[in-house]
């Protein structure tokens, strides 16, 4: 295969080929987040729509309880965009003893959880200081990259402040992964 | 196929396999937009270069009249970056009755048009408030995600203000899609 | 192949099929940059981690001396995120004769070098004016798109100011490519 003429007269073991259409894939879209208690120094995970509108999961890629479950080992492209919105951050206006305040910030992290491993792994992080001088502000953070994942790995999206996430439109805040 | 040893001695129907090299793909790059009248509340669509420089379309993925035409149903990764540029947004400077103005903003939308469906579908949106205090400003908005598309679907990129799009370099503003 | 029943009884040349798992792929992560001399008007290239942590190269995709070396011609998806961080840019505060200063900026370029071609080609550019009024600031620039590359092409990531790159975490600043 791989570019050579195919000659069926000699038995041969080929590298595993598979139809692209049966690879695990998911595109999840934002939903309004339910109020949850979360620890001060821990970024809360978003939960997602997995079947309505533009959202889907297919070929054994399942979504459950804020996690995308990886059904098969391989290299995956993983992406997410989170749109944040808020009222003016006053960080530039109040200066104590002439010293600017620590800026506010917005952060998105795509995290991998492996049951056999005690600590989650941060795969991707987008973090931005927010020091707006206008009134209400809004902006997206986009992330995407390729990672080698194992069957059973779980993926989630964590954010620095769940109350700043724009949940109003499925095209503004989303999360997806597909086996390459 | 799919990981089993290949045994040509028994007739068998296989899942559809296809060479990766013959999948529909396109990468379009920015061109200077022609002067056009557009309606106040409608985001204008960008038109694109499809064959010069870095731009290409291949394997029946065609570009015509601001649209990428999807030649085959399947899951596509779609992406775009639009770099915006402008002179100072005055939103932070003019405050009426101590109240900041509504911020200016820049928005990119990747839109799907299906002839059998009356309304376009917004697949991806990147939107950002712009309230710059320096002189000239510039910044990109990047979008990318996977969607299930049907043969005959058309994709376009719409922006909030066509006059703010940086058309000067093909690596700053672009639009692409490929069948997974 | 391509969806037809497979009939091994007649010799036939098939489109080149190949296992997805043996395609060239790399995900590189940030390391602290070594001090280097670079020319004033030339953006320095970043060097990268290619095997520790989340980083890997596989299937003849090699990393050497700041370059990813393309081992096989084809269409590649190429991506990078660079997180920048700095102290306040004062560009908005010092106005000479009522005129705002030229803004500071941060820029990422993904560049292709082809030995047979004298000039590098800029594939992707993300550039952003930075005119922050708070104290320390930080923000990412993300890029990703598909390009037709030739065997022997080399890819690198250049930045406008290497001292502003956040090298502290492998999930904040990264560079990758994979054959589609």
């Amino acid at each position: 295969l791989k570019g050579q003429e195919f000659a069926p007269s000699h038995q041969q073991v080929y590298a595993p080929l598979r139809a692209d259409g049966d690879k695990p894939r998911a595109h999840l879209t934002v939903v309004r987040q339910t109020p949850t208690q979360h620890f001060k120094n821990q970024f809360p995970a978003l939960h997602w729509e997995h079947e309505l509108g533009l959202a889907f999961t297919k070929n054994r890629m399942n979504y459950t309880n804020k996690f995308l479950l990886i059904p098969e080992s391989g290299d995956y492209f993983i992406y997410s965009q989170v749109t944040f919105r808020g009222m003016t951050s006053e960080c530039s206006e109040i200066r104590q003893a002439g010293r600017p305040n620590k800026p506010d910030s917005i952060t998105v992290v795509i995290t991998k959880v492996t049951d056999s491993y005690p600590e989650p792994t941060q795969l991707l992080m987008g973090t931005k200081s927010v020091c707006e001088v206008g009134s209400n502000w809004f902006q997206p953070i986009y992330l995407g990259a390729m990672f080698s994942l194992q069957e059973g790995d779980k993926l989630m999206v964590n954010v620095s402040d769940i109350s700043l996430v724009d949940y109003t439109k499925e095209d503004k805040t989303f999360f997806g992964a597909f086996l390459l | 196929l799919k990981g089993q040893e290949f045994a040509p001695s028994h007739q068998q129907v296989y899942a559809p396999l296809r060479a990766d090299g013959d999948k529909p793909r396109a990468h379009l790059t920015v061109v200077r937009q022609t002067p056009t009248q557009h309606f106040k509340n409608q985001f204008p669509a960008l038109h694109w270069e499809h064959e010069l420089g870095l731009a290409f379309t291949k394997n029946r993925m065609n570009y015509t009249n601001k649209f990428l035409l999807i030649p085959e149903s399947g899951d596509y990764f779609i992406y775009s970056q639009v770099t915006f540029r402008g002179m100072t947004s005055e939103c932070s400077e003019i405050r009426q009755a101590g109240r900041p103005n509504k911020p200016d903003s820049i928005t990119v939308v990747i839109t799907k048009v299906t002839d059998s469906y009356p309304e376009p579908t917004q697949l991806l949106m990147g939107t950002k408030s712009v309230c710059e205090v320096g002189s000239n400003w510039f910044q990109p908005i990047y979008l990318g995600a996977m969607f299930s598309l049907q043969e005959g679907d058309k994709l376009m990129v719409n922006v909030s203000d066509i006059s703010l799009v940086d058309y000067t370099k093909e690596d700053k503003t672009f639009f692409g899609a490929f069948l997974l | 192949l391509k969806g037809q029943e497979f009939a091994p009884s007649h010799q036939q040349v098939y489109a080149p099929l190949r296992a997805d798992g043996d395609k060239p792929r790399a995900h590189l992560t940030v390391v602290r940059q070594t001090p280097t001399q670079h020319f004033k008007n030339q953006f320095p290239a970043l060097h990268w981690e290619h095997e520790l942590g989340l980083a890997f190269t596989k299937n003849r995709m090699n990393y050497t001396n700041k370059f990813l070396l393309i081992p096989e011609s084809g269409d590649y998806f190429i991506y990078s995120q660079v997180t920048f961080r700095g102290m306040t840019s004062e560009c908005s505060e010092i106005r000479q004769a009522g005129r705002p200063n030229k803004p500071d900026s941060i820029t990422v370029v993904i560049t292709k070098v082809t030995d047979s071609y004298p000039e590098p080609t800029q594939l992707l550019m993300g550039t952003k004016s930075v005119c922050e009024v708070g104290s320390n600031w930080f923000q990412p620039i993300y890029l990703g798109a598909m390009f037709s590359l030739q065997e022997g092409d080399k890819l690198m990531v250049n930045v406008s100011d290497i001292s502003l790159v956040d090298y502290t975490k492998e999930d904040k600043t990264f560079f990758g490519a994979f054959l589609l």
Epitope: - | T34, P35, T36, H38, S135, L164 | -
Partner: antibody
Framework: QVQLVQSGAEVKKPGASVKVSCKAS????????INWVRQAPGQGLEWMGW????????GYAQKFQGRVTMTADRSTSTAYMELSSLRSEDTAVYYC????????????WGQGTLVTVSS | QSVLTQPPSVSGAPGQRVTISCTSS?????????VHWYQQLPGTAPKLLIE???NRPSGVPDRFSGSKSGTSASLTITGLLPEDEGDYYC??????????FGGGTKLTVLG
């Protein structure tokens, strides 16, 4: 140094066409857009459109749409502006100007070509 | 249709300072690329004086400066010289991507 040298004056009858040339030197012709601007006697400047010499793409002012054609010959680094269906009010000096990509200001100008439309 | 409005004429004695204004009828003019200023001396082609509201191309004396306030741009000439006499035009791009010129201002240097 950058130079834009235009063709000589023309006298045309109403309904005819005129083609003005603008030869560029001192820079890479395909790297900068060329604009055409005209000035009727004793009047102000009026923009007609732009031409990208590399791709041949053009953008015309609405007023001239359908009557103006801008082209480039890359082999000779020459831009052309053709205006058809001439009328007496098209009598003007026609300028080509090279644009600054970043700001779209008109940085270098040709010396101008007087086109007189008279029966 | 957007317009840029300039005063038809201004004048000043040598050594004086004059300011020419350029007011836009629409907020989208100049939003992307600013306002540019050109000088046209009698019988010659226009010459770029100021680009993007403020910036002087090399070779333009620092007697010429540009500024912006709200929807207006201004060109200021200090230390007026007799050779500054001529026409001055502001120019910008509107939201439909068409270039616009102001009507022009005739500068007369007195005496």
């Amino acid at each position: 140094q950058v130079q834009l040298v235009q063709s000589g004056a023309e006298v045309k009858k109403p309904g005819a066409s005129v083609k003005v040339s603008c030869k560029a030197s001192g820079y890479t012709f395909t790297s900068y857009d060329i604009n055409w601007v005209r000035q009727a006697p004793g009047q102000g400047l009026e923009w007609m459109g732009w031409l990208n010499p590399n791709s041949g793409n053009t953008g015309y002012a609405q007023k001239f749409q359908g009557r103006v054609t801008m082209t480039a010959d890359r082999s000779t680094s020459t831009a052309y502006m053709e205006l058809s269906s001439l009328r007496s009010e098209d009598t003007a000096v026609y300028y080509c100007a090279r644009e600054v990509p970043e700001t779209a200001a008109f940085e270098y100008w040709g010396q101008g070509t007087l086109v007189t439309v008279s029966s | 249709q957007s317009v840029l409005t300039q005063p038809p004429s201004v004048s000043g004695a040598p050594g004086q300072r004059v300011t020419i204004s350029c007011t836009s009828s629409s907020s989208d003019i100049g939003a992307a690329l600013g306002v540019h200023w050109y000088q046209q001396l009698p019988g010659t082609a226009p010459k770029l004086l100021i680009e993007g509201y403020y910036n002087r191309p090399s070779g333009v004396p620092d007697r010429f400066s540009g500024s912006k306030s709200g929807t207006s741009a201004s060109l200021t000439i200090t230390g007026l010289l007799p050779e500054d006499e001529g026409d001055y035009y502001c120019q910008s791009w509107d939201g439909t991507l068409s270039a616009l010129f102001g009507g022009g201002t005739k500068l007369t240097v007195l005496g």
